[in-house]
Each structure stands twice: as C-alpha cells, then as structure tokens.
Interface confidence: low
C-alpha cells in the first residue's frame, strides 16, 4: 500500500474535508517541479517566481539576475533562451499553439552587453522555430517553412532553403505525422556540437491525402482546416536529410545525406539524428513496415564537401516478434571515442536493456540484464553511465536512477535514488549539467513531488530545489483516497493494477467501481506517481473505487507482454481489462451491478470495445475522443502495430477491430460518447462513424461534442467535460447529487 501525505489523528478527522470537483478544475492541488536550465558544468538559469531570469553558480553559491522581469514584460515574453556566448537572449512572445509540440511565436533579441534590443535586421513574424547554435550566437530559424541562418543576431539572414510551402514542403520543422508520431518535437533541425554544420529534414507532403474539418469560429462561414495527414495505408511524406556548412554558407550549399540502400528500396521513415562530432553524424532510418531499423554513421568528406555513410557503419536492428523498439526506436548515446555507442534494445530474453556497440550489433556487449527494463540513458561520461530502470523491488511502475562505472573493470552498478526518500520517492527523472558535474533529481511520487540538486561525483544531495511545502500544507485537511499498487497473476500473465480507494474504505462494504483505461501499445498507467485529479475526487467525495490496469501491450515488462498485441489491436487489451474486473469482483468489496469504464483516445477505443464485449459486466461507460477504426488513424502509429490495411497484409483485422462492427452490443449499456470537432489527431470522423452505426442499429446512447476543440479538450471545455462526466457516472451509480 502506498501511503499518501501523513494523516492527522482520528480525533481531528471531523475538521478534514473531501476533495471537491472544484478543487480539481481549479488546479488547487497541483505540484511544481524544478528543472535547472543548465548553461555549464556548474551554472544554471531559472525563472524566479517574480519572473526574473536568474543565473545560479553552484560552486560559488552566487546568483544574479541576467534579465529583469521588466525587460521580459516589455515584450510580454513567456519564454527565453540565452546564447551560449552569453551575449544575447531571445525573448519569445505571442505564443500561438499549432499541434501537440508545434507553435509559432514572435522573437526579440536582447543584447546583454548594452542592455538594448537588437535593432536592424529584426526577425520576421511569426517564426515556427528558432534556436541558438551550441557555441557562439549564430541563429537558425524557420519562417514560412524555410530555414534561415544569421551569423550574429544583427546580421541580415542567409536563406538556406527556398522550396518551403505551407502544407506541401516543410524544411526544418516536421509535418503533422512526423511531429506527432515519429520525432515528438516541433523542430527538425540539429546543430553539430560546435555549430559548424546544421542538419535539417525536408518533408514533402505534396502527395499526402488531406484531412479537412470545419472550424466554426464566430464568422458567418466556418473556416476549413486542411492538414496533410496520412491515414493507415495512405501515401506518406517523403523525407530527405540535408547538412549545410554554416561557417561558409555563401558557397557551400546543403548536401543531402544518403539513405541506406536496404532502407531506400521501399517506403521508409527517418526517425532521428544524433551528432557525434562536428564531422560525424548518426542518422536512424526505419522501413515503413516498422520491424527493421538502420542506424547509419556518416562522415564528412572534406574533398567533395559531402557526407559519406559507409555500409560498414550501418547497424541493423530488427524485431522478429513485433515492431522495432518500444514506442520509438531508441537513440544512441555515443562514447568519447566518437564511434562506439550505448543503446537500449531487446536482449535474447526479450527485455529492453543497455548494450554497448563497438563494431557490429551482433557483437554488442550487454551492459544491463534481468527481468526488468532499462528505460532511459541520461548521460555517458568518461567513467560513468547514468540510466533509469524499473529494477528496484520488481515494481514495473517505478523509476530509479542508476550509475554504472564504465571506467573500471568489471563495471559496478549503484542505485543513486533507491534509498533516498524511499516512501515518498519511487519515480524519478534526472537532468545533468555538462560532464555530469552536477545533476537535479525530480521525484514525481508516490508522495508529494520534490526536486533536489546533487554532486555528480559523490551523488551527495546539495540542496532542495522545490519541495512543494504549500501543497503539503494545503493537503493537511484533505481526506485523500488511499492508493495501492499490486498485481494479479492470470494464465501466465502478470496484470499490475493501481486501486484508488475511498478515504474510509471498508472491505466489508460494497463500492461502485470505475475502470480508467488507456491501454495503448507501449504505454504504462500503473505508475508510482503523485496525482490529485478527477479520479481522486471520485474516490474521496463520491466513494467510488477506481482501478487502472496494465494489460497486454503495455510497456516495461518485457517483449512477451508488449508485443502480444502485434497486428491484433483491440483484442487482448480489452480481454485483460475484463479479466481484471472479474478478479476485483472476487475481492468482495465491489458492487457488481455498478461497474463503469472510461478512457480517452486509445482508452476511448478500449472502453468502447469493453462496453461492447457482451460480458454484461459494465453498466455504463464513457469514451472521450476514441479511435473507432484503425483505418482512420495515422499511418506511422497504426502500421507500427497493425501492418497495412491491404488484403495481402492485415485488412481483415482492421475491419474486425472497429467499434462500429459491435454497434448492436451497446444496446444493454449506457454509453456516453464525447469528441472535439477540431480534433487534428483522432478525427471527429471516428465518433461520427460510431454515432452513425449506433443510430443505424437503433441503439440509444448519449453524446457530447465540443465545438472547435482539439484532442485535449482544454480551457472551459475541460470544466464542462468533467462536470458532464461526473453527472453521467453519478446517475449510472445512483449517487445523489
């Protein structure tokens, strides 16, 4: 059982109150984290509570304001970036969100040496992406899908690309599908370590089918939003990688980096770029059928000013049991010799572990091993490798930080975080300064989050950066639910679950059960993290038991569980939720006439299929922005797990796994279907088709749409959504308002 913030004695329990929905919607109990913005081995920047940008030196203990809140306010800046030579700061304002990561903004350059904004050759607006070179103060930016370079902020720009066109050619920024499903960034350009070269991707979306939807706004006629969006089996973007010498761009044009022959022979993706040195770069490519990935190390040829990618420097990663990698193919972390690297991939037992590759993947040396998984490599120094894993005490939903000494033989392993604040902190991430001289640990729970600063040599805690004292005080008179993380063993499958129990939980009583599900491939819902959210309120105030279950297809427990859903989405994820519900009923405290399920996105798909499973287990359920057919979702994501929707591949299962095919089965459940009309990700089309199928089957259901809202249903829609879902559940469970 996970103990939440300490309780006062029973005698005082009357003064304590349950969580309210208002608490949740107002974000009353949200927490803060502290991630230093490292600018050297021992210095970092941080934006203070009053919005000054402050530079901290760990070794001298000194701090000083490099940019005042007055300067920030003068241009309404919401973000900043210091040039590596510390001469200039860019200030970002007029933030305008586009998709999940992308946004446009206006940028101003402030000269720290004279305390004035740079005048002359100002940046155009709005800019799609802007960044400093890693050394000095060169600027690269993307404007109207073309890349520009400035040697100094006041210089005229040098235009690198000329073919950028809205919705057609994207230079230095990803198109929709690469942003969401492959790169997970707003940018597609990468400076070499010393700023000599700039690599960038060009995405050609000319032949991609376009998704069009209405944006109602408040004009007389709605606008139509058009996005090149490849759905499963459709034509994909064509990607090319170029590198330009930024020192002499006036005569060295962009040079294309060749694609490995075994990749170029059919449709393919570019998955990531990692600079090794100024004259060595590593590119990762992936076949459209995503079980073959190639890592290609390329070298600069001075004579021809081109990039050479010898076959001897191609490393192939192939999965025979599923797709390549986890959610994404892992990226390499190069060692100091600039040719060997560390990388996470499946070992012979099907667990993802760190391997050291010196010459070939076949000769890789396994660095970690066991029936657990290495999750992230944070930093490799001359003598240490820092990584995170879920090894400690065999809880897959934990994250601890480990250090392996690679400078000595045999390498020794030390858990840096396992015993620091064992009850409070079981789920960590880390942020390292240059050469790992210092690092910050950010603990997300299960107790109240805390951020601390540590010495990279001794691991000694130097100071607390953020401990959320105000939150701790605010929670003192709140009756929080109890949480437990346990596992069920069913037919050789381990199902980890998190159960959220009402504050005065009594095993001899019967409680309504709400299953919250996501269940997408390589996801994890059962994590030892702190949260005060909607389901906390439902347990605290409304007396519900809430359960989250990680079934087949979920991550960090080995390939057997992960790849079980390969080419069969919508089968085992649903089965495992149902199996878990049956086990929960057997525990004796669940009212089996009051069981509901809800989920969002992939979770909306799973909850819909669970409701339509014909088991009679669920009284009601909610699907928010669900996928309803895999033919409607993005190619990159869908085909990774499902293959192609063609007769000679996997069309049959594409057809069998739709929500619409099960319309009849919704007759005996109460179903609430919710979707935003401007969802760029899971298109409103998905819910429109469910609704049409239910109408055609003459099945009654409830629905709510959110006009002009995207996949996140943000702002006032959030309040309306959770209020609406609360009413629906309380009605379903016969709870008084």
């Amino acid at each position: 059982i996970v103990l939440r913030p300490s309780r006062v004695h029973n005698s005082e329990e009357n003064t304590m109150r349950a969580l309210t929905l208002k608490d949740i919607l107002n974000g009353t109990f949200s927490y803060k984290t502290f991630f230093p913005n490292w600018i050297s081995g021992q210095e970092y920047l941080h934006q203070s509570a009053d919005n000054n940008i402050v530079l901290y030196n760990i070794e001298t203990g000194q701090s000083y304001t490099i940019l005042s809140n007055r300067t920030m306010k003068s241009v309404n800046a919401s973000n900043y970036g210091l040039s590596p030579d510390r001469q200039f700061v860019y200030l970002e304002s007029d933030y305008s969100k586009l998709w999940r990561y992308s946004y446009t903004a206006t940028y101003y350059i402030y000269d720290l040496s004279n305390g004035e904004f740079v005048r002359g050759n100002e940046l155009p607006r709005p800019i799609q992406y802007l960044c400093w070179s890693p050394v000095g103060s060169k600027l690269a930016y993307v404007y109207q899908n073309n890349i520009y370079l400035k040697q100094r902020p006041g210089d005229p720009p040098f235009q690198i690309t000329f073919n950028g066109r809205e919705n057609k050619i994207f230079n230095g920024i990803p198109d929709w599908v690469y942003e969401e499903e492959m790169l997970a960034t707003k940018y597609a350009l990468w400076w070499s370590p010393n700023g000599k070269f700039l690599a960038y991707a060009e995405f050609n979306d000319t032949d991609i089918p376009v998704i069009a939807y209405s944006y109602y706004g408040d004009e007389q006629y709605p606008r139509t939003i058009n996005i090149p969006y490849p759905k499963a089996g459709a034509k994909n973007p064509v990607v090319r990688i170029f590198i330009i010498d930024t020192t002499y761009p006036a005569y060295v044009g962009p040079q294309e980096v060749p694609v490995p022959a075994m990749i170029a022979s059919s449709d393919y993706y570019f998955s990531w770029l990692t600079w090794v040195t100024d004259e060595r770069v590593c590119l990762q490519w992936l076949k459209r059928v995503q079980n073959v990935s190639v890592l290609s190390i390329c070298d600069f040829r001075e004579d021809w000013q081109t990039w050479d990618c010898p076959k001897t420097q191609e490393h192939i990663e192939e999965s025979r049991t599923g797709w390549a990698g986890g959610f994404f193919v892992s990226t390499p972390v190069f060692s100091y010799d600039a040719i060997s690297y560390y990388k996470i991939f499946s070992d012979k037992d099907g667990y993802k572990h760190i391997h050291y590759i010196k010459d070939t993947v076949e000769n890789a040396i396994q660095i970690t091993s066991g029936k657990w998984e290495a999750i992230n490599i944070f930093r490799v120094t001359q003598d240490s490798l820092f990584y995170s894993s879920n090894e400690f005490e065999e809880y897959p939903g934990r994250r601890n930080i480990y250090r392996i000494s690679i400078g000595s033989y045999p390498p020794s392993k030390k858990c840096v975080t396992c015993h620091l604040r064992k009850e409070r902190c079981q789920y960590y991430t880390a942020s390292f300064s240059d050469y790992a001289k210092y690092y910050a640990l950010v603990c997300y729970g299960p107790g109240i989050p805390i951020s601390t600063l540590h010495d990279g040599r001794t691991d000694q805690e130097i100071k607390i950066l953020e401990e959320n004292k105000e939150l701790e005080n605010a929670l003192k008179n709140i009756q929080l639910p109890k949480e437990e993380i346990k596992k069920l063993e069913v037919d050789e499958i381990t199902l980890w679950y998190k159960m959220i129990l009402p504050p005065q939980f009594d095993r001899s009583k019967k409680y309504p059960l709400l299953i919250q599900v996501y269940g997408g491939p390589c996801s994890q819902s059962v994590r030892s993290v702190f949260a005060v959210n909607w389901i906390s309120y439902l347990a605290s105030k409304e007396g519900m038991v809430i359960a989250l279950v990680d079934g087949r297809g979920t991550a960090f427990q080995g390939d057997k569980l992960l790849y079980a859903v390969y080419r069969k989405l919508g089968v085992y994820e649903v089965e495992d939720q149902i199996t878990a519900v049956r086990k929960f009923i057997e525990m004796g405290f669940i009212d089996e006439k009051r069981i509901a399920i809800w989920g969002w996105s992939y979770g909306g798909y799973v909850s819909s299929l669970a409701l339509a499973s014909g088991t009679g287990l669920f009284k009601c359920g909610i699907a928010v922005a669900p996928v309803s057919s895999w033919e409607y979702y993005a190619s990159v994501y869908t085909e990774r797990f499902m293959g192609l929707p063609t007769k000679d591949d996997n069309l049959e299962h594409y057809k069998n796994s739709t929500v619409m095919a099960r319309a009849e089965y919704f007759r005996n459940v109460d179903y609430l279907l919710i979707h935003g009309t401007a969802d760029d990700n899971v298109h409103f089309q998905n819910s429109a088709q469910i609704a049409k199928a239910l109408v055609n089957a003459q099945v009654d259901f409830q629905a709510m749409w959110y006009s002009d809202q995207n996949h996140g249903l943000s702002g006032l829609s959030t309040n309306h959504l959770y209020t609406h879902m609360t009413h629906f559940l309380k009605q379903c469970f016969s709870l008084s308002d």
Epitope: F162, N163, E202, Y248, Y251, G253
Partner: antibody, heavy 117, light 107 residues
Framework: QVQLVQSGAEVKKDGASVKVSCKAT????????ISWVRQAPGQRLEWMGE??????TPNYAQSFQGRVTITADESTSYMEVSSLRSEDTATYYC????????????WGQGTLVTVSS | DIQMTQSPSSLSASTGDRVTITCRAS??????LAWYQQAPGKAPHLLMS???TLQTGVPSRFSGSGSGTDFTLTITSLQSEDFATYYC?????????FGQGTRVEIK
C-alpha cells in the same frame, strides 16, 4: 561590383597543356567557390570542376579527373588542361558560385582554346 | 549524373510573343534549378535561381515555375534583347549539369 577577367585566347598543339587564369577585379573571391565550365562550339555548357579558395581542395567532374588541375589564391583561379586533344577545342569560362556553390552568378568573358594537330 | 533535357531545342518567335521553354530532370531536384541566358559570343548570365526567383535586375517578363523534375521558363512579351540561347542547370547534386540549350531566334 565583382568582375571576373580571364586570360586571352590560346592556340595549342595536340598533346600540349594550357593554363587559363581568372582574376577577380574590384575584390577577392571572398569565400566564394570558383567553377570552371567549358563550351565546345555549338554544344551545351559542361561543368569541369571548382575550387573554394578557403578550403583549397578542388572538386572535379568525373570526366575531367586526372587531366584538369584547378588552383586558386585569394583573387585568381587557374585551370590547366593537359594532354590536349582536338575535342578540347572550346571556350572555357570561370564563374563564381553564389549562395549555392554551383549556382553561378558572375561569369568571366570566356577564353577560347583551339587545339590543332 | 543527373541529365537535364530542354525542349524545344530552338524556336522562332516575334517581338511581343509569349515564349515557354521546358526543362526536365532525370530525377527529383526539388527546386534547385537555375536558368541562364547566353547572347551570341557572350558568357552566360544568371536569370533565375530556385526555379522561380528572379535575379536582381532581371525584367519581370521572365518567370519560372516547377519543382521536382519538370520546370518551365516563360517570357511573357518577347523583346529584341531576349533573342539568345537559354540553359537550365541543376545545382542539387554534384556534378552540376546543364540542359542542351534552347535557341530563341527572330521569326
């Protein structure tokens, strides 16, 4: 305004060598690449190779590799063709690379080289 | 090497005519295409880069279009000084290559 001024016309015998110069007047090549392009009578333009004075390493088209030598200092580039044959009779141009090395924005007036047997 | 093919090889036109010259690349060259004009006995002169961008000082009656493999140079109203040979050139992949030229002569 940069101008590229080339050396005068040459008549050479079969098997001889010729060296053509290209001088930047009113400035230096200042970081730009200098390409050499030839045009046989009534034929298309043919790129022979280039040199970036800052890098100093020439690049040659495959068909000219081994027979052509391109050199440069800050304001003059030279192109030498050895083992001349009658098919080398052509006008030889030097040209400056613009923002892309092979995009040629300023050209010399051309040097006619006639190879006679 | 990338082959560049122009058509027609020559054309006759009168002053004031609209003239279109096409250029095809043997593989995708994106927009990395230049057009040059060469008057008889003179050196080539850069008209256009990036397939569509006129060089400073080039009259607006010249325009370019296309990307990928197919490109066009259009002169909307032919003037006497426009009678010359026109070459397209790709500067996308080394070595740069030229089309065989299109001679525009007076009808």
């Amino acid at each position: 305004q940069v101008q590229l001024v080339q050396s005068g016309a040459e008549v050479k015998k079969d098997g001889a060598s010729v060296k053509v110069s290209c001088k930047a007047t009113g400035g230096t090549f200042s970081g730009h690449a200098i390409s050499w392009v030839r045009q046989a009578p009534g034929q298309r333009l043919e790129w022979m190779g280039e040199i970036s004075p800052m890098f100093g390493t020439p690049n040659y088209a495959q068909s000219f590799q081994g027979r052509v030598t391109i050199t440069a200092d800050e304001s003059t580039s030279y192109m030498e063709v050895s083992s001349l044959r009658s098919e080398d009779t052509a006008t030889y141009y030097c040209a400056r690379g613009a923002n892309y090395r092979a995009l040629l924005d300023y050209w010399g007036q051309g040097t006619l080289v006639t190879v006679s047997s | 090497d990338i082959q560049m093919t122009q058509s027609p090889s020559s054309l006759s036109a009168s002053t004031g005519d609209r003239v279109t010259i096409t250029c095809r690349a043997s593989q995708d060259i994106s927009s990395y295409l230049a057009w040059y004009q060469q008057a008889p006995g003179k050196a080539p002169h850069l008209l256009m880069s990036g397939a569509t961008t006129l060089q400073t000082g080039v009259p607006s009656r010249f325009s370019g279009s296309g990307s990928g493999t197919d490109f066009t140079l259009t002169i909307t109203s032919l003037q006497s000084e426009d009678f010359a040979t026109y070459y397209c050139q790709q500067y996308y992949i080394y070595p740069p290559t030229f089309g065989q030229g299109t001679r525009v002569e007076i009808k």
